[in-house]
């Protein structure tokens, strides 16, 4: 007899998690001298620990401690580029700008970025059928508290001057509902970070609009600045421009405004 | 009651300084971003200059930069424009205004205004 | 010289309905919300319509704004001798980087 199977509202576990997974710790670990330590089957074993034969919405933080702890990684806390609801340009930039850090440029982030996955209490399966979305079924989710687990590790170890990519094309460019809103904002640490720069990145071609005096610029600046953090704010009015400035940083048309 | 209460303003000789003061009361003056606007006699409204919440953020027209400096002290509640190297042209009365909530560049309440009066 | 373009003056008879109109180019009015202030001789300014087409609350509904294009105009309906003010627009000038305010319209009530 078939065993019934919870029916979640999101999708299921990606294709191939595992060996996904461990194919981009190993990839990772080749590229980054830093990283040659790491024993992949050790992270592969730490990551399932964190949710197979756990009910998917009752997974904690403390589940992800072994993987954490095997993922720890020293990323320069001066050089971090946070970002919401922008991740490809954020990711175009830090490929250009080698010193400069996403949390999916660190192993951890690397590992699961853009992967769904799930397990199903007290068997050993991997649901690839659905898996719990966040508003309709549980925020206490394997991939949300993943997200949340290390977002918060990666905000705490940033220092002086942090630097956060906000998407300008949509009507809360600051939400205080996303990851960055509502972790990473939070666990920035004043005693160490002296300023949050946001770059607010404009999406039409002809748009002079100051988008550093949007609303939910107003409120991320009175969150922070509540925070005992110093703020500023940049338009970069064209982004292709700003990425062709990074590569090109001496080109006669980088020196006006982006 | 929400009010803005400029102060500070007065004669004084062209390239002399001067130091314009804004006290606010009745909303959380640490919310809210903050303007000078002044209006020459006769003249209408001309947009000086603009500061955020934790100071952050700062504009200024091309007619006084370089030469005023806008600040703010959330734990007096009190907003400043210090003014240098002051013209004839910046006679004036000069309005503070509180930026409207979750909004771009409205001002939703204004003080009465000082009287800054720049002639030998 | 402003940056915005207003009329100097315009009039009406009590009851009637006057429209006054700021123009711009696609710097200010076109990409940024438009703002209106009424000033009373000899009392400070009074944000009258906000982002566009809002009207703060304790603005009566004879005021309303609109915009299109680089233009934007403030329509006054049921004009009342209390009406008589300067009107300004204002917005901001993203090439000026700057807020900017036209000149003012005088409105006076007949």
């Known amino acids: 007899v078939p065993r019934w199977r919870q029916q979640w509202s999101g999708p299921g576990t990606t294709k191939r998690f595992p060996e996904t997974v461990l194919a981009r710790c190993v990839k990772y670990t080749e590229i980054h001298p830093e990283m040659r330590h790491v024993d992949c089957q050790s992270v592969w074993d730490a990551f399932k620990g964190a949710f197979i034969s756990k009910h998917p919405c009752n997974i904690t933080e403390e589940d992800y401690q072994p993987l954490m702890k095997l993922g720890t990684q020293t990323v320069p806390c001066n050089k971090i580029l946070l970002w919401s609801r922008i991740k490809d340009l954020a990711h175009q930039f830090t490929q250009v700008q080698r010193d400069m850090f996403t949390l999916e440029d660190t192993l951890l982030g690397y590992l699961a970025d853009d992967l769904t996955w799930c397990g199903e209490f007290n068997t050993s399966k991997i649901n690839y059928q659905s898996c719990p979305d966040w508003r309709k079924d549980c925020s206490n989710n394997p991939v949300s508290v993943f997200w949340k687990t290390v977002s918060r590790r990666f905000a705490e170890a940033a220092c002086d001057v942090v630097h956060v990519m906000l998407n300008g094309s949509r009507s809360k460019i600051f939400d205080k509902n996303s990851t960055f809103g509502s972790v990473e904002v939070h666990n920035l640490q004043p005693e160490k970070v002296q300023t949050l720069e946001a770059w607010v990145i404009h999406g039409g071609r002809e748009d002079s609009r100051d988008l550093c005096q949007d609303p939910t610029i107003k409120e991320l600046e009175s969150i922070i600045s509540k925070r005992n953090i110093q703020f500023s704010c940049k338009n970069i009015y064209r982004p292709d421009k700003f990425l062709q400035c990074v590569k090109n940083p001496e080109d006669s048309s980088c020196t006006s405004e982006i | 009651e929400v009010l803005l209460l400029e102060s500070g303003g007065g004669l004084v000789q062209p390239g002399g300084s001067l130091r314009l003061s804004c006290a606010a009361s009745g909303f959380t003056f640490s919310d809210y971003w903050m303007s000078w606007v002044r209006q020459a006699p006769g003249k209408g409204l001309e947009w000086v200059s603009t500061i955020s919440i934790s100071a952050g953020i700062i504009y200024y027209a091309d007619s006084v930069k370089g030469r005023f400096t806008i600040s703010r002290d959330n734990s007096k509640n009190t907003l400043y424009l210090q003014m240098n190297s002051l013209r004839a042209e910046d006679t004036a009365v000069y309005y503070c205004?509180?930026?409207?909530?979750?909004?771009?560049?409205?001002?939703?309440?204004w003080g009465q205004g000082t009287t800054v009066t720049v002639s030998s | 010289q402003s940056v915005l373009t207003q009329p100097p003056s315009a009039s009406g008879t009590p009851g009637q309905r006057v429209t006054m109109s700021c123009s711009g180019n696609n710097q200010n009015i076109r990409d940024n919300y438009v703002y209106w202030y009424q000033q009373v001789p000899g009392t400070a300014p009074k944000l009258l319509i906000y982002k566009d087409d809002q009207r703060p609350s304790g603005v009566p509904d004879r005021f309303s704004g609109s915009k299109s294009g680089t233009s934007a105009s403030l329509a006054i309906s049921g004009l009342q001798s209390e009406d008589e003010a300067d009107y300004y627009c204002?917005?901001?000038?993203?090439?000026?980087?700057?807020?900017?305010f036209g000149g003012g319209t005088k409105l006076t009530v007949l």
């Open positions: 205004a509180k930026d409207n909530w979750n909004d771009y560049y409205g001002m939703d309440v």
């Open positions: 204002a917005t901001w000038d993203g090439s000026l980087k700057a807020r900017v």
